[in-house]
Amino acid sequence: FGISGKHFITVTTFTSAGNIGEDGTLSCTFEPDIKLNGIVIQWLKEGIKGLVHEFKEGKDDLSQQHEMFRGRTAVFADQVVVGNASLRLKNVQLTDAGTYTCYIRTSKGKGNANLEYKTGAFSMPEINVDYNASSESLRCEAPRWFPQPTVAWASQVDQGANFSEVSNTSFELNSENVTMKVVSVLYNVTINNTYSCMIENDIAKATGDIKVTDSEVKRRSQLQLLNSG
């Protein structure tokens, strides 16, 4: 590789989180090199012998891949020349969490960067008016969370109010015995007010808002991964 031993290239990774049972991405970029055949990408995981993934001479080389990653990884091959070494990971498991290294070698030089990969479960909450309840109440449900999150309610009108005394939260284990369904009910709600249900663990924070008026119900949800970037 000629000068590759003398020069270092910039490799950038982003701490990210994987949602178990879904696709995940380990993000890594590097200084582009138009010579695809001269690019080597190696993904390694701390504590694992063998490679997570290797891409060289324009194609995957899985000869040294650790068995736990077999059939579960791929680079975005068409984006390698523009400096994308990110790794696609199939069916994220809790055991995939850890420290990964993205190692790059090109005709310009070599470099590497680490990333922390967190795994868990997170999902959007949905808030509905609970018409079955004896008093006006709201029901906030989110299908999959792990580790167990905290749940808090807030109100636009009663800012700073503590709703823990007028809400009830339960966690129901899902069929795979890892993730849990989150259900929180807020009692004694008033009309013409916006309420927020906030679910948070160390991986993600999700918020569901609901505005109830005489004529309509408006909902909005958002999900934010924590400590990423």
């Epitope: 995957d60 080389d61 000869s63 077999r70 059939g71 791929a74 069916n91 069929s175």
Partner: antibody
Amino acid sequence: EVQLVQSGAEVKKPGASVKVSCKASGYTFTSYWIGWVRQAPGQGLEWIGDIYPGGGYTNYNEKFKGRVTITRDTSTSTAYLELSSLRSEDTAVYYCARLDGSSYRGAMDSWGQGTLVTVSS
Amino acid sequence: DIQMTQSPSSLSASVGDRVTITCKASQGFNKYVAWYQQKPGKAPKLLIYYTSTLQPGVPSRFSGSGSGRDYTLTISSLQPEDFATYYCLQYGNLLYAFGQGTKVEIK
């Protein structure tokens, strides 16, 4: 265009073996998993196993373990399914299929035309 | 191994009907469920993968949804060319598994 062309129909006696071939073209053969699926007459689809041609790694349905071998020849871009100790219930159309996602084992997105294997005494 | 239980095994419907086919996984959670259409004497055709992603070239009347153990294929308005057998596939684990199939027939 991805193409998978399978070998012709076979008639075998019980206890014999059969080897079905699947020649791939239109993509990099060593970069995508190839799976095998069978369908008995009037029945549903049954997954047999798959192979990653780039390294020869295989996965098999427990039901067929010990009787089935999936191999590949990278020089001819061909995958093979060999089934031994044939019995009448192995009579089926055998399909090969490419798995989407390159080294990532995805769903089967391109299929061969099928090979009818008949087991009869 | 994960088994996929598909229902119904057959259904009769008319052109323009909304048709729903379900698959239930025996265990676990993952989004790796695909749906195939097969016509007599032909190889299966991939319609949907990763629960809800439409394969390029497949009409938008086909849609997939689901989570946990329950997955659904919906045909919003059945067309004459949609009369066929449909299969779900679980491909998230080491061992893949098909559902038993649903034959959609003309009423």
